[in-house]
């Protein structure tokens, strides 16, 4: 058993039929010495008396809020949550496995640049009675600070068979050094509580591996005289790290014909312009990626050939 | 970079960009990683590898003030990785193609080192990897980790040379 926050305790249980459970001793946080009784939210019967209460926790029916009283006066509460371990593996019932880039990916994170600011998100089918909190740091032996905000519900997707909720959180490294080569991983720890179930999820990464630039901006097209070719130009996204002579991007340009199926070969350049052949009704699309490190490509930016 | 002279920024930029490409093309060659447990993955690659850290002055402001600290660190890293890529981690079984990306990467690391330190200038004793002969079964994982680490090192070095070529070239 360990204390998650004041008066909230997590009991780690091996979850199998006829498991012996865990004996937990709850202490009433009071200066009173006698006349103390205990009840739980599950039943209003008096469970015991005295400053401490010993309970056997085997299942969710044994979890919940325990209250110590003196007469009609409430002296304190202790909330007991369960963290299930089945076959040596902690339960992951609350979050949905996103399966990308590999199985058991519950937390996904992205950064728009090297500033030390990143966003993480997760999916759940649960909308109510769920509480999330996120902590983060860099390195584990001598952790360096990262400040994370409050997780918020950012989207709701309804499909035929279920509704999926997307939560996200933004974090900022306290003393980020955008130009340095990272040697210690960023760790993100998510605590999830659904009713009386506690679970935790972690992710470990370098900013360089989660960088995904915003799409190139101000994408423009200029027809070339007496030619079916056009000059396409664009700019670095505003959100990308500066100076661009240091934090350089590479770009790929592709002509997408009207039916969207047929795509011409990608032309990749380090400049912010390119010459391509453009047919009526076609679209030109451009994406960006770090020039020197193969992290994610940005989403496409589009301009019409018309 | 003896004394206070400047490196050939444009040449260094071109070669460091080529190195980045080679390091990424060498990476998939490493074989199926699912066969290997990422044990101790935490911060083990960081062991004795010379990382380009915040205090090394490889950021745009640091380069404007004095390029020497940063270039010194890059030289150390190049020397270190060049030794690693020639060690039995990469020359032993499972064999890699001698003319494949790792072989080219090794030769190009040497090339960039020489651009930064012309013959006859051995001004410091660089950090050398502590190389005990590795067991073949460890090698695929070690190669994978070393190349991942090298990719990160080269990305920073390439940014330094690109910025230098754009802003510090005579």
């Amino acid at each position: 058993i360990w204390e998650l926050e004041k008066d909230v305790y997590v009991v780690e249980l091996d979850w199998y039929p006829d498991a012996p459970g865990e004996t937990v001793v709850l202490t009433c946080d009071t200066s009173e010495e006698d006349g103390i009784t205990w009840t739980s939210e599950q039943s209003n019967k008096v469970l015991g008396s005295g400053k401490t209460l010993t309970i056997l926790v085997k299942e969710f029916g044994d979890a919940g809020q325990y209250t110590c009283h003196k007469g009609d006066k409430v002296l304190g509460h202790s909330k007991v949550l369960l963290h299930k371990k089945e076959d040596g593996i902690w339960s992951t019932d609350i979050l949905k496995d996103q399966k990308e880039p590999k199985s058991k990916t519950f937390l996904k994170c992205e950064a728009k640049n090297y500033s030390g600011h990143f966003t993480c998100w997760w999916l759940t089918a649960i909308s109510r009675d769920v509480k999330f909190s996120v902590k983060s740091n860099r390195g584990s032996s001598d952790p360096q600070g990262v400040t994370c905000g409050v997780p918020t519900l950012s989207a709701e997707r309804v499909s035929v068979d279920h509704t999926e909720y997307k939560f996200s959180v933004e974090c900022q490294e306290d003393n980020a050094c955008p130009a340095a080569e990272e040697s210690l991983h960023l760790e993100v720890m998510l605590d999830a509580i659904h009713k009386l179930k506690y679970e935790n999820y972690t992710s470990s990464f370098f900013i360089r591996d989660i960088v995904k630039p915003d799409p190139p901006q101000n994408l423009q097209m200029k027809p070339l005289k007496n030619s079916r070719h056009v000059e396409v130009s664009w700019e670095y996204p505003d959100t990308w790290s500066t100076p661009h002579s240091y934090f350089s991007l590479t770009f790929c340009v592709q002509v997408q014909n009207k039916n969207k199926k047929e795509k011409k070969d990608r032309l990749c350049v380090d400049k912010t312009s390119a010459t391509v052949m453009c047919h009526k009704d076609a679209k030109i699309r451009v994406q960006a990626r770090d020039r020197y490190y193969s992290s994610s490509w940005s989403e496409w930016a589009f301009v019409s050939c018309n | 970079v003896p004394g206070d002279s400047s490196p050939a920024w444009t040449q260094c930029q071109q070669l460091s960009q080529k190195l980045c490409t080679l390091a990424w093309s060498a990476h998939p060659q490493m074989g199926p990683m699912e066969l290997l447990r990422e044990e101790g993955d935490e911060e083990t690659t960081s062991d004795d590898v010379p990382h380009i850290q915040c205090e090394d002055g490889c950021d745009p402001q640091g380069l404007r003030d004095n390029t020497q600290f940063c270039l010194q660190r890059i030289r150390q890293g190049l020397f270190f990785y060049e030794k690693l890529l020639g060690s039995d981690i990469f020359t032993g079984e499972p064999a890699l193609l001698p003319d494949g990306p790792v072989g080219q990467l090794h030769a190009s690391l040497l090339g960039l080192s020489q651009l930064l330190q012309p013959e006859g200038h051995h001004r410091e004793t660089p950090q050398t990897p502590s190389l005990h002969p590795s067991q073949p079964w460890q090698r695929r994982l070690l190669r994978f980790k070393i190349l991942r680490s090298l990719q990160a090192f080269l990305a920073v070095a390439a940014r330094v040379f690109a910025h230098g070529a754009a802003t510090l070239s005579p």
């Epitope: - | 060690s87 039995d88 020359t91 499972p94 064999a95 079964w137």
Partner: antibody
């Protein structure tokens, strides 16, 4: 073409030393390790040790430690195996071989130890 | 040290026969195993590396299987030039060790 050519047969007295050479050609000598293997008459194969010509790193079979020395000369792309304190049971064919999974072996050098 | 136990130590077979030679490692070696063919007075010739990969130029009648501790070399249809001694070898860790050999003779 890619090949390993070994030095000729040797006849040695017990207690003496023998040095066998293995010249590599057709590939970059420093990109592979070089193993030494021996085979006594009518017997199986026995690994003695290897060298990484790039950095002269060696790895020896405990059985031969102290008696075997493997060296390499990068300038001539040649590996050497020296075995000292020879005894009659060292009579064997000695092979050099590039990485096991590349299939390149020398033709073998017969060393006879006899008084 | 990891021991390699090869069986049988010898076998007699006829041209066209299917021949199977097994090799057992005393510890787990994943697929770090080679098979060699050796003829009298010649150096060993690599047939299979990585337990299952056929060396370039080796006829497809030779195949390797197995992983972990149990490995097999199969010659699907024995040819006159296949009469020789066959060795397995592990390269998982040092010291690298060879099996005792299997001599394939004409019945």
């Amino acid at each position: 073409q890619v090949q390993l050519v070994q030095s000729g047969a040797e006849v040695k007295k017990p207690g003496s030393s023998v040095k066998v050479s293995c010249k590599a050609s057709g590939y970059k000598f420093t990109r592979y390790v070089m193993h030494w293997v021996r085979q006594a008459p009518g017997q199986g194969l026995e690994w003695m040790g290897y060298i990484n010509p790039y950095n002269d790193g060696t790895n020896y079979n405990e059985k031969f430690k102290g008696r075997v020395t493997i060296t390499a000369d990068k300038s001539t792309s040649t590996a050497y195996m020296e075995l000292s304190s020879l005894r009659s049971e060292d009579t064997a064919v000695y092979y050099c071989a590039r990485n096991w999974d590349t299939g390149l072996w020398g033709q073998g050098t017969t060393v006879t130890v006899s008084s | 040290d990891i021991q390699m136990t090869q069986s049988p130590s010898s076998l007699s077979a006829s041209v066209g026969d299917r021949v199977t030679i097994t090799c057992k490692a005393s510890d787990h070696i994943l697929k770090f195993l080679t098979w060699y063919q050796q003829k009298p007075g010649k150096a060993p010739k690599l047939l299979i590396y990585g337990a299952t990969s056929l060396e370039t130029g080796v006829p497809s009648r030779f195949s390797g299987s197995g992983s972990g501790t149990d490995f097999t070399l199969t010659i699907s249809s024995l040819q006159p030039e296949d009469f020789a001694t066959y060795y397995c070898q592990m390269y998982w860790s040092t010291p690298f060790t060879f099996g005792g050999g299997t001599k394939v003779e004409i019945k």
